[in-house]
Amino acid sequence: MMTGTIETTGNISAKKGGSVILQCHLSSTMAQVTQVNWEQHDHSLLAIRNAELGWHIYPAFKDRVAPGPGLGLTLQSLTMNDTGEYFCTYHTYPDGTYRGRIFLEVLESSVAEHSARFQIP
């Protein structure tokens, strides 16, 4: 029975050329997280955090993606093309998969509003 919930940073905006943290948090479950997948709006995988093997950043994103903090992901050197949906998929035992959605808007303006549904400590 899937009792858990995924909280995400929700809809966020960031400045072109800057960086942004994508963060998901799984709560309300005793399930064990075995892998977290991060993917982009076109379903291409950005990165995987495997419980045993650690982080794997996919080659196309190696220069612009940094692992962490925690199970999150940091996108750097943002371009306008980075605007869109991002998904975290938590593979958990024995619950199954939990999926969270974040919408990132990359702004041309010098000042970008940054709103989040929760603060990362």
Partner: antibody, heavy 122, light 107 residues
């Protein structure tokens, strides 16, 4: 080599307690959930439940609540099963088994301990 | 709870035979099914996971197929060491039950 090594067979009297240990080696203990499976003589396999090796939180299948306790000592990469107030019907082989596979569609019990025979008899 | 029913419970066959064991689930479990082999007095050994993926080190004469509610384990050519007991297990929705087992005996 990835392996799980369990403690030896035990003979106990009704009402006593027993602790079965399961020592893991060859992998990162806290990266894989650990399960316990019972097999009564001449019978099939019964999943008793599992323990989250990250948090130590145990989950028990219906029928294995109350007298059964799963625990861990991560400093020595060992999982434990304790059974209290033993009854004759607890006589069985108890196995620990690692959940292998990292994605939900590939989970399975990929590494098993050799089993520990617990006999309850007066 | 999802129940698994294996058939047959006993199977008599000869060395070299092709045999098939069926596992039926009481509800749809996608491809979340594993097959295990157990020798008497030994721990089970994982043969197949995700319904059809052969576990590393397992001989290629073993294969698995199916999805949804009906699954099969096939041994293409029985070897003397294959005359043991086989179990299916679903890993889709708690609790992860096992089938009752199929004992393969020498005819």
């Amino acid at each position: 080599e990835v392996q799980l090594v369990q403690s030896g067979s035990d003979l106990k009297k009704p009402g006593a307690s027993v602790r079965v240990s399961c020592k893991a080696s060859g992998y990162t203990f806290t990266s894989y959930p650990m399960n316990w499976v019972r097999q009564a003589p001449g019978h099939g396999l019964e999943w008793m439940g599992w323990i989250n090796t990250n948090t130590g939180n145990p989950t028990y299948v219906q029928g294995f609540t109350g007298r059964f306790v799963f625990s861990l000592d991560t400093s020595v990469n060992t999982a434990y099963l304790q059974i209290s107030s033993l009854k004759a019907e607890d006589t069985a082989v108890y196995f620990c088994a690692r959940t292998g596979g990292h994605t939900y569609d590939s989970y399975a019990f990929d590494v098993w301990g050799q089993g520990t025979m617990v006999t309850v008899s007066s | 709870d999802i129940q698994l029913t294996q058939s047959p419970t006993f199977l008599s066959a000869s060395v070299g035979d092709r045999v098939t064991i069926t596992c039926r689930a009481s509800q749809v479990i996608s491809s979340s099914l594993a097959w295990y082999q157990q020798n008497p007095g030994k721990a089970p050994k994982l043969l197949i996971y995700a319904a059809s993926t052969l576990q590393s080190g397992v001989p290629s004469r073993f294969s698995g197929s199916g999805s949804g509610t009906e699954f099969t384990l096939t041994i293409s050519s029985l070897q003397p060491e294959d005359f043991v007991t086989y179990y299916c297990q679903h890993l889709h929705g708690y609790p992860y039950n096992f089938g009752q087992g199929t004992k393969v005996e020498i005819k």
